[in-house]
Interface confidence: medium
């Protein structure tokens, strides 16, 4: 469909409040240093404007695209060279190239404070302008999420408020809001790590590649609907995630607001799972379905050798379409198992892919694909074992022991990644134990390496920023599916030259017995990043000396009547302790 | 019962074009994604296009990607083929089909309609 005017067709779709939260969003994902207040201003007047052109929509300017009146307004803010420095370059490029550059200076890791809840001061703030605290939500979420997906922010929104209301009445609101706020933090912070992997894939593999991923997701959730069904939603998910990466956040809302409404429309083709989120309001819809239980399998499925190795036909029927015979095959082979990680199902693929590309061209091509099934079992025992020997290690050293044996593993195989990069990624791969070990056996292959899949393409996002190893780059670029792999089958740098040691890393200060446990964790651990970096062949007997005695040293000074004192005393004896260890 | 009948075939140059239809019945036509396949003389059936029930996405076999095009209008239970640049190895009895529930094969077709490429 075509409109005059594209912001008046995308406010009457979606009304003021959605309206107005996806352009906060939209600023907020762009500019990301900008002060809440700045951005309200912006949105403010870009509000006004759309209202103008609902009005009348061939007013002045109505009928320029969304892009172009974002991109005018960002370019219009006096100070944004000198608080964004080259983003200002990007004002000098018409559009598209414009918003591409834009889309470019986004930064995944923003120097952004962490955030941190004080239930009474947020309680005064909700009940003093609901509006401002859901605003101010969105804000913070975006401003550090550049890629987060739009229209779900806005779900955790409501869901952020909801706890608010609740808790806000509460005789112990700390221990009403702080449990639930921690929990949504968690969602959040795994929501963003789905959509940046999202992005990732359509902007470094293309769209065929994110289509091949949703299309065995969505088969192994939706195991009734047929293939076209499936291919359907595919096609307009790509489309909706496609627009959202893209920074259109408008159109992927009222895109993904269709979608939703068309798969309730026809849920009978597709899921018996689906009844409870259809009767739900738009935005809990859209949730409720992309979280959709798994379809129980029809009854009656043939076994898939009758299609794809048995037939006689099978090189015909691969020959005449590609795409849409591997993409049977995909769809078939997920659909019966919904056991398996989506990046196991792609590799399986692949292979047959290859098989067929190899032995059709054969003589005789059928005896040569014979035995194309077998050719999978090495690549499901492969995840297989490995979560089997990790979560063995897990349940004997616990998180906080299993994130450091990740450390020292990681920092062995890349040294050259920068300390804070390390320690972040080590603690979420070591997070997959918590997550996926209690799982039951057949949830835990799907549940571990799509986990792991999400953590290290976090790794490939902070790498890509500032590269450092070619090993990173190569695992990182080379395959999305085999990502995984390529990390596990990393052996120790050889190659790698010992860090100086420098004593001020090994300086610690009374800071440190205030701090949370967690940030206490990862003071411990970048110290332990540090020390291999120093003495990358360090045993583990000796990383255990140290890391021990590290703890006793902290105990100690955070037990004395002077903690600074005892740091100032202690600390170079600690130092010196540490190299007499590592001699 | 289901019931497909194609029609608009015929003879046709080598360049030329045409626009096959196939008139369904007996089945809910706008729920169901159909296909159109063909057969040349002494050949085996040629899978050629699908079509979703809503109209997207479309898919194409390689050999025909670019010059066909399949297209439906569920209101009238008639699901069509225009094909452009016609060829002499298009020639074949076409018949629409009602997809199945799973594989990439079909569960009712009409009783076709040729279309001749020749000068």
């Known amino acids: 469909d075509t409109y005059k005017s594209e912001i008046a067709h995308r406010f009457k779709d979606l009304g003021e409040q959605y309206f107005k939260g996806l352009v906060l969003i939209a600023f907020s994902q762009h500019l990301q240093q900008c002060p809440y207040e700045e951005h309200v201003k912006l949105v403010r007047e870009v509000t006004e404007f759309a209202k103008t052109c609902v009005a009348d929509e061939s007013a002045e300017n109505c009928d320029k695209s969304i892009h172009t009146l974002f991109g005018d307004k960002l370019c219009a803010i006096p100070s944004l060279r000198e608080h964004y420095g080259d983003l200002a370059d990007c004002c000098e490029k018409e559009e598209p190239e414009r918003n591409e550059c834009f889309l470019q200076h986004k930064n995944d890791n923003p120097d952004i404070p962490k955030l941190k809840p004080d239930p009474v001061a947020l309680c005064a703030d909700f009940q003093e302008d609901e509006q401002k605290f859901w605003g101010k939500y969105l804000y913070e979420i975006a401003r550090r999420h550049p890629y987060f997906y739009a229209p779900e922010l806005l779900y955790y929104a409501i869901i952020y408020k909801d706890v608010f209301s609740e808790c806000c009445q509460a005789a112990d609101k700390a221990a009403c809001l702080l449990p639930k706020i921690e929990h949504l933090r968690e969602k959040v912070l795994t929501s963003a790590a789905k959509q940046r992997l999202k992005c990732a894939s359509i902007q470094k593999f293309g769209e065929r590649a994110f289509k091949a991923w949703s299309l065995a997701r969505l088969s192994q959730r939706f195991p009734k609907a047929d293939f076209t069904e499936i291919s359907k939603i595919v096609t307009d998910l790509a489309k909706v995630h496609k627009e959202c990466c893209h920074g259109d956040l408008l159109e992927c809302a009222d895109d993904r607001a269709d979608l939703a409404k068309y798969i309730c429309e026809n849920q009978d083709t597709i899921s018996t799972k689906l009844k409870e989120c259809c009767d739900k309001p738009l935005l809990e819809k859209s949730h409720c379905i992309a979280e959709a239980k798994r379809d129980e399998l029809p009854a009656d499925l043939n076994p898939l050798e009758h299609d794809f190795v048995e037939d006689k036909e099978v090189c015909k029927n691969y020959k005449e379409a590609k795409h849409v015979f591997l993409g049977t095959f995909l769809y078939e082979y997920s659909r019966r198992h919904p056991d398996y990680s989506v990046s196991l199902l792609l590799r399986i693929a692949k292979i047959y892919e290859a098989t067929l590309e190899d032995c059709c061209a054969k003589e005789d091509p059928p005896a040569c694909y014979a035995t194309v099934f077998d050719k999978f079992q090495p690549l499901v025992d492969e995840p297989k074992n490995l979560i089997k020997q990790n979560c063995e290690l897990f349940e004997k050293l616990g998180e906080y022991g299993f994130q450091n044996a990740l450390i020292v593993r990681y920092t062995k195989k890349v040294p050259q990644v920068s300390t804070p990069t390390l320690v972040e990624v080590a603690r979420k791969l070591g997070l997959v134990g918590s997550r996926c070990c209690k799982r039951p056996e057949e949830e835990r292959l799907s549940c571990a390496e799509d986990y792991l899949s999400l953590v290290l393409n976090r790794l490939c996002v902070l790498h890509e920023k500032t590269p450092v190893s070619e090993k990173v780059t190569k695992c990182c670029t080379e395959s999305l599916v085999n990502r995984r792999p390529c990390f596990s089958a990393l052996t120790p740098d050889e190659t790698y030259k010992p860090k100086e040691f420098v004593e001020g890393t090994f300086t610690f200060h009374a800071d440190l017995c205030t701090l949370p446990e967690d940030e206490k964790q990862i003071k411990k651990q970048t110290a332990l990043v540090e020390l291999l970096k120093h003495k990358p062949h360090a045993t583990e007997e000796q990383l255990r000396t140290v890391l021990g005695n590290f703890a006793a040293f902290v105990q100690k000074c955070c037990a004395a009547p002077d903690h600074e004192a005892c740091f100032a005393v202690e600390g170079p004896k600690f130092v010196i302790e540490i190299r007499g260890i590592l001699a | 019962e289901v019931q497909l009948l194609e029609s608009g075939g015929g003879l046709v140059q080598p360049g030329g074009s045409l626009r096959l239809s196939c008139a369904a019945s007996g089945f809910t036509f706008d729920t169901s994604s159909m296909l159109w396949v063909r057969q040349a003389p002494g050949k085996g059936l040629e899978w050629v296009s699908v079509?979703?029930?809503?109209?997207?996405?479309?898919y194409y076999a390689d050999s025909v990607k670019g010059r066909f095009t399949i297209s439906r209008d569920n209101s009238k239970n008639t699901l069509y083929l225009q094909m452009n640049s016609l060829r002499a190895e298009d020639t074949a009895v076409y018949y629409c089909?009602?997809?199945?529930?799973?594989?990439?094969?079909?569960?009712?077709w009409g009783q076709g309609t040729l279309v001749t490429v020749s000068s």
């Open positions: 079509i979703h029930q809503s109209g997207t996405p479309t």
């Open positions: 089909a009602k997809f199945p529930s799973s594989r990439m094969k079909f569960d009712y």
